[in-house]
Interface confidence: medium
Amino acid sequence: DSEEDEEHTIITDTELPPLKLMHSFCAFKADDGPCKAIMKRFFFNIFTRQCEEFIYGGCEGNQNRFESLEECKKMCTRDNANRIIKTTLQQEKPDFCFLEEDPGICRGYITRYFYNNQTKQCERFKYGGCLGNMNNFETLEECKNICEDGPNGFQVDNYGTQLNAVNNSLTPQSTKVPSLFEFHGPSWCLTPADRGLCRANENRFYYNSVIGKCRPFKYSGCGGNENNFTSKQECLRACKKGFIQRISKGGLIKTKRKRKKQRVKIAYEEIFVKNM
């Protein structure tokens, strides 16, 4: 397998939890607009999941632009962990568990899970890829843990893996420990495989940043994101070399990498938008 010849590093990159956005504009890329002023503003970066500074030109642009860091945080970040822990301790379900399953208005159907308040269990459904509501989970485990009754929620058995929500492929779940690696390649290498909105079944490869390998997926023929390569070699060249291994005392060992000009595309499959 040429993939193994390419590099023998085992990637143990940590995986961020599903991105849950309060407003869809939080997913827009920073847009300085056509004017030439130099104004310090803040935007929400979906890749780092933080509010960051950028220079705004003074006109046009988009709604992902805030006067202050606080305003940005207020509009685009939510403390999911605290909210979920609190509700678990109180043995209450978050309100969104009682919402009906909502595919949203898009047509990029992917498998997701929702809590069905009628049957009192998590069930599978097809999510269109945008809008919808927060009763929408990437994995069955996450849905069970947050919304189902039971003393300890759902316990996965001794494999520590999860179902990938994009294409139902089974991929190892990353351990939630400090990462030994940093990714410095193109940002789209960290996005999930995205079938897109059409109905074709083209053989493509995407970089799975959790396991550090290029994996096949079926591309629909349109839409999707840039984590989409016609060959495994192309995928490896673009993404595999982007990891920098950390060693103790903060030192870095660099691996060779090729960088493409970054064009940020948003993988809407990973974005949960609250209905407004």
Partner: antibody
Amino acid sequence: EVQLVESGGGLVQPGGSLRLSCAASGYTFTDYNLDWVRQAPGKGLEWVGDINPINGATLYNQKFKGRFTISRDNAKNSLYLQMNSLRAEDTAVYYCARYYGDYDAMDYWGQGTLVTVSS
Amino acid sequence: DIVMTQSHKFMSTSVGDRVSITCKASQDVHTAVAWYQQKPGQSPRLLIYWASTRHTGVPDRFTGCGSGTDYTLTISSVQAEDLALYYCQQHYTTPYTFGGGTKLEMK
């Protein structure tokens, strides 16, 4: 060649238990979810539930939850259906089927095993 | 649960005929519909998934279409080996549910 072979069917009394097995071969067992579907004599198909072979996460048709349990043994490439408190209306051919995520459909089916619940 | 209704339990046809089998969902299933063929004494065989995509090895005389709640499986020129039971199934949400089946038989 993908093959799914069910076994364990037979005659059982009402209230009794039975464990069905499905041996999978011809593909990587942990790459696909597996489903159980049943078909009563002369009737249509009814989905029972499915399992993610890697982590054992299961989804059930609410109708069977509590009485039926789906499990698997990755070392043996095998899927199981434990059926308890059986009733006459559980009489059916039970099929195991591979659930292919790219299709969101069951692309390979076993030949089925007949379960008869009768006194 | 989503109810899938195949209004015709039986359909009579002749070799070479064009036949359409219909299926209606009790709610919008967003094209998440599969069609299966089952011959007597055999297990079901996947024909179509996502309403219109033919499974590998399925002859091109079988086509599927539909959206929302209404779906159709069409056999453009029926062959003798096509005489079987046909089931639609929604894979939009669990529990996955099947139609009652339509038996294609010779006139």
